[in-house]
Amino acid sequence: NPGASLDGRPGDRVNLSCGGVSHPIRWVWAPSFPACKGLSKGRRPILWASSSGTPTVPPLQPFVGRLRSLDSGIRRLELLLSAGDSGTFFCKGRHEDESRTVLHVLGDRTYCKAPGPTHGSVYPQ
């Protein structure tokens, strides 16, 4: 399973799924343009499964208020896209297995290299 490769525009919703991972425990994001959101390079956790059944989302991350689980676990997520979200989303399993989704957000390569806001939460019209 090569994983997903999804295209979308700011303001659209995309579904991220955890294909081939038996017990998903967390999602990790490696941004293509980290500086666009004022971040450093590398992977960062964006969501964990929790025993309460409600996934844990770190408070200081770019997807707060835009990412939600579509099922009782964290196998399927819905993300409301924003400029700068381009990157690779990894679904990590309990047994070290993982799946990946490569996301390309329309205009990111241009928008994220332009001077201006680094948070990327509002897409210029």
């Epitope: 295209d7 919703r13 390309h104 329309l106």
Partner: antibody, heavy 119, light 107 residues
């Protein structure tokens, strides 16, 4: 009204290159992905690739890598497909089309451009 | 690459019939499945996107369903203007791929 107007039919010699154009009206290509699709005579549809016109970010089916080049000119609201080193296998109708992304399919298509490779 | 298979390459039905065209993906495509209609003159139109959402202007007699690897397009009340070839396409991963098509004719 959304329209994609493609250039006219081409008759080209083996080994040559051809550049097809697709001019959009009714929308700004910078706000969509532009795709190119190939259809050989009496065959199905083959996805060649797509471009994000705002940043010239192109992706291709590996079998068309090096054979096809997709470009865009946002000032003229147009996209282009160049096919090089033409052989009889490249004889086909080529469609340009637009998409808002993976969730939405390819929602509007051009009328197609027929390319015939013959000596 | 993900292979998309339309096992029926052609079918014939009567006006007013309910027709179902099926499509199978070589792996789970998470509902990123679209259907297109190509008329005999070559014109291509999107009918349904994301498995079951009707594109604007498409008659409600067209519907789509499915999940995982198996998907279908249904025409509930066949009309003469539905004579065409129908293609499925996955948008789950690059390269996007199409099924081989199902040619629909009127008996």
């Amino acid at each position: 009204e959304v329209q994609l107007q493609q250039s006219g039919a081409e008759l080209v010699k083996p080994g040559a290159s051809v550049k097809l154009s697709c001019t959009a009206s009714g929308f700004n290509i910078k706000e969509t992905y532009i795709h190119w699709v190939k259809q050989r005579p009496e065959q199905g549809l083959e996805w060649i690739g797509r471009i994000d016109p705002a940043d010239v970010y192109g992706r291709y089916d590996p079998k068309f890598q090096g054979k096809a080049t997709i470009t865009a000119d946002t000032s003229s609201n147009s996209a282009y497909l160049q096919v090089s080193s033409l052989t009889s296998e490249d004889t086909a109708v080529y469609y340009c089309a637009r998409s808002y992304g993976s969730s939405y399919g390819i929602d509007y298509w051009g009328q197609g451009t027929s390319v015939t490779v013959s000596s | 690459d993900i292979q998309m298979t339309q096992t029926t390459s052609s079918l014939s039905a009567s006006l007013g019939d309910r027709v179902t065209i099926s499509c199978r993906a070589s792996q789970d495509i998470s509902n990123y499945l679209n259907w297109y209609q190509q008329k005999p003159d070559g014109t291509v139109k999107l009918l349904i996107y994301y498995t079951s959402t009707l594109h604007s202007g498409v008659p409600s007699r067209f519907s789509g369903s499915g999940s995982g690897t198996d998907y279908s397009l249904t025409i509930s009340n066949l009309e003469q203007e539905d004579v065409a070839t129908y293609f499925c396409q996955q948008g789950y991963t690059l390269p996007w791929t199409f099924g081989g098509g199902t040619k629909l004719e009127i008996k």
